[in-house]
């Protein structure tokens, strides 16, 4: 239904707290360099204006679209051109072009310092002094570093943060209470960020149809007892919600997500038997819970997939009659039978089925042609299964750090032109798949591994797009989203690469490394490892292991020495010489 004042409508639906949080996220995701105080001032102005519209929907400017209102606010910021360069040109455009322009200027890798967590005492003090400002800072800092973070989900993480602080700041040992809990939230939020970025990439590059296919597969796996019409309705609604969030329409997105959660909870009988626990929770927790609810039990009496999609004489007629519906039904039927497959794999199978029908239905005797299609799925299924087995075996043997190093070597050989920081970040993220997925039951490993890897590789592609340096990466990134992971897996050593010359300073370390936190130490060592591979792309695993063991031993020895500086300055050059010899 149309509302006289869109801003009043959203304010009423969302309530002041969520309204302000979402407006802050929106501004922080658009203008990523502005300080919290600058954004907080704008948010207050927008909120005050919204209240005047609630009081009188006919008041001046209350009938304007949210894009117009928000865009006007952003464009009124002083020194916009000095701080944001060509983004200021967006302000010369009219809506909807102006908003599209803002979206195009979102930076996936803003040059902002890493978000450092204050010490427990300091955190608790500022939280107690002003919880609202404290949470505002959290929303601002996360949103500006992750410009596509799913806004209603970020409100959920802020709520989690709030609850943890409320609980831990009352404890005697605040540090040991806060650290593991906040680390847990951070890890989940980072995964949520890359997953959502993948959804927005899907939407931006391949349109709503591609995202809806993803949603049909995912929902069919989770709700195998829901019929196709129900799954289609949920997929359509979910597509709308994600389109809005990816498009910067955060108020509409959060409002529609709440509506979708409400619908699911009112229609549990036709969706799933597993929703009740989620539906008993308050809004943010409810929507989050529904998004990761466990799979419902599969119906016991499902007929073989071949009946309707291979053996039925009407296959080509059904395909001709309503292509998207028929393929959607195939995806639904296949996905509900395979909660053990990744969504990426299910979409590859659906694509293979579509290609088979395109080819076979054009032939003189189609049934003879498409009769073997299910057998042709086998290699497509075996490939990711082997990937999971090989990588989980390696993870179990090496542990997370060793596994990350193995991936780092592999990916540096595949794309040595990519910057070392990007390779290290990618390898560390890819390596976490072991801890995240390899410990799960067998039937949950494949969907966990492949869909997580796809999301991480999407980030690799986004970073590479900014500065394309590797033909290998460009090739894999320009294909369809679901083919990316198999494409990267299939890459081998880049034979066109001219090895980097050996620079001693790259492998020269100082005593300050000793005081770094473990994570930072690992990153330093992994940076050196990537550089070694760039120097000798064809070094054997054994050679690299020898060098890295020597390096670890050197750090251990010098960090324990009484005179660390002398140890580093005398032993360092010896290490560099040994490295060169080992790789000669």
């Amino acid at each position: 239904e149309a509302h006289k004042s869109e801003i009043a409508h959203r304010y009423n639906d969302l309530g002041e707290q969520h309204f302000k949080g979402l407006v802050l996220i929106a501004f922080s995701q658009y203008l990523q360099k502005c300080s919290y105080d600058e954004h907080a001032k704008l948010v207050q102005e927008v909120t005050d204006f919204a209240k005047t519209c609630v009081a009188d929907e006919s008041a001046a400017n209350c009938d304007k679209s949210l894009h117009t209102l928000f865009g006007d606010k952003l464009c009124a910021i002083p020194n916009l051109r000095e701080n944001y360069g060509e983004l200021a040109d967006c302000c010369t455009k009219q809506e909807p072009e102006r908003n599209e322009c803002f979206l195009q200027h979102k930076d996936d890798n803003p040059s902002l310092p890493p978000f450092e967590r204050p010490e427990a005492e300091a955190m608790c003090t500022s939280f107690k002094e002003n919880p609202t400002t404290f949470m505002g800072h959290y929303l601002h800092e996360v949103a500006r570093r992750h410009p596509y973070f799913y806004a209603p989900e970020l409100l959920y993480y802020a709520e989690q943060y709030n609850e943890i602080l409320t609980q831990c700041c009352a404890e005697a040992d605040k540090e040991s209470c806060l650290t593991p809990k906040l680390d847990g939230v951070k890890e989940k939020a980072l995964v949520s960020s890359v997953r959502q970025r993948m959804k927005c990439s899907s939407m931006q590059k391949f349109g709503e149809r591609a995202f809806k296919a993803w949603a049909v597969a995912r929902l069919s796996q989770t709700f195998p007892n829901a019929d196709f019409a129900e799954i289609t309705k949920l997929a359509t609604d979910l597509t709308k919600v994600n389109k809005e969030c990816c498009h910067g329409d955060l108020l509409e997105c959060a409002d529609d997500r709440a509506e979708l959660a409400k619908y699911m909870c009112e229609n549990q009988a036709t969706i799933s038997s597993k929703l009740q626990t989620c539906c008993d929770k308050p809004l943010l927790k409810k929507a989050h819970c529904l998004s990761e609810v466990e799979h419902d039990t599969m119906p016991a009496d499902l007929p073989a997939i071949a009946a309707d999609f291979v053996e039925d004489q009407e296959v080509c007629k059904n395909y001709a009659e309503a292509k998207d519906v028929f393929l959607g039904t195939f995806l639904y039927e296949y996905s509900r039978r395979h909660p053990d497959y990744s969504v990426s794999l299910l979409l590859r199978l659906a694509k293979k089925y579509e290609a088979t029908l395109e080819k076979c239905c054009a032939e003189a005797n189609p049934p003879a042609c498409y009769g073997t299609v299910l057998a042709e799925f086998q290699p497509l299924v075996e490939e990711p299964k082997n990937l999971v087995k090989t990588n989980c075996d390696l993870y179990e043997k090496l542990g997370e750090y060793g596994f990350q190093n193995a991936i780092l070597v592999r990916y540096t050989q595949k794309a040595p032109q990519v910057s070392t920081p990007t390779l290290v970040e990618a390898a560390r993220n890819l390596g976490r798949v072991g801890t995240k997925c390899c410990t799960l039951p067998e039937d949950q490993r494949l969907p966990c591994v492949e869909d997580y890897l796809s999301a991480i590789l999407n980030r690799v592609c986004l970073l590479h797009e900014k500065t394309p340096v590797s033909e290998h990466v460009t090739k894999c990134c320009s294909g369809s989203l679901v083919e990316r992971r198999p494409c990267f897996s299939a890459l081998t050593v880049d034979e066109t690469y001219v090895p980097k010359e050996f620079k001693a300073e790259t492998f020269t370390f100082h005593s300050d490394i000793c005081t770094l936190p473990e994570k930072e130490k690992q990153i330093k060592k992994q940076t050196a490892l990537a550089e070694l591979v760039k120097h000798k792309p064809k070094a054997t695993a054994e050679q690299l292991k020898t060098v890295m063991d020597d390096f670890a031993q050197f750090l251990d020895t010098c960090c324990k020495a009484a005179d660390k500086d002398t140890c580093f300055s005398t032993e360092g050059p010896n290490l560099v010489t040994r490295c060169k010899d080992a790789l000669a």
């Epitope: 080509c316 001709a320 032939e363 003189a364 049934p367």
Partner: nanobody, 115 residues
């Protein structure tokens, strides 16, 4: 909505000829292989002939090989079956179908071969 409209049937003497047509609508005709099938009481549905989307490949049942010719005009969304040297056993209702289907979709056209 897919629609197939057969025409051209009638009564013909043994050894005679008949051209059948099938007008198609509601789908992208030029992308689908098409089939002629026939139905006669006591015999059930029998596959007669098939043609690929571009018309570059054709198939025939042994019982009609050398006598029947399948063709298509994608510009007119029309499928044809030229039947020569007709025999009494060719008496049936003839249907065109999409992509090898043996399920008659349209009304069909009656062909009777009798002296």
């Amino acid at each position: 909505q897919v629609q197939l409209q057969e025409s051209g049937g009638g009564l013909v003497q043994p050894g005679g000829s008949l051209p059948l047509s099938c007008e198609a609508s509601g789908f992208t005709f030029s992308r689908f292989g098409m089939t002629w099938v026939r139905w006669a009481p006591g015999k059930g549905v029998e596959w007669v002939s098939g043609i690929s989307s571009l018309g570059d490949s054709t198939l025939y049942a042994d019982s009609v090989k050398g006598r029947f010719t399948i063709s298509r005009d994608n510009a007119k969304n029309t499928l044809y079956l030229q039947m020569n040297s007709l025999k009494p056993e060719d008496t049936a209702v003839y249907y065109c179908t999409i992509g090898g289907s043996l399920n008659p979709g349209g009304q069909g056209t009656q062909v009777t071969v009798s002296s």
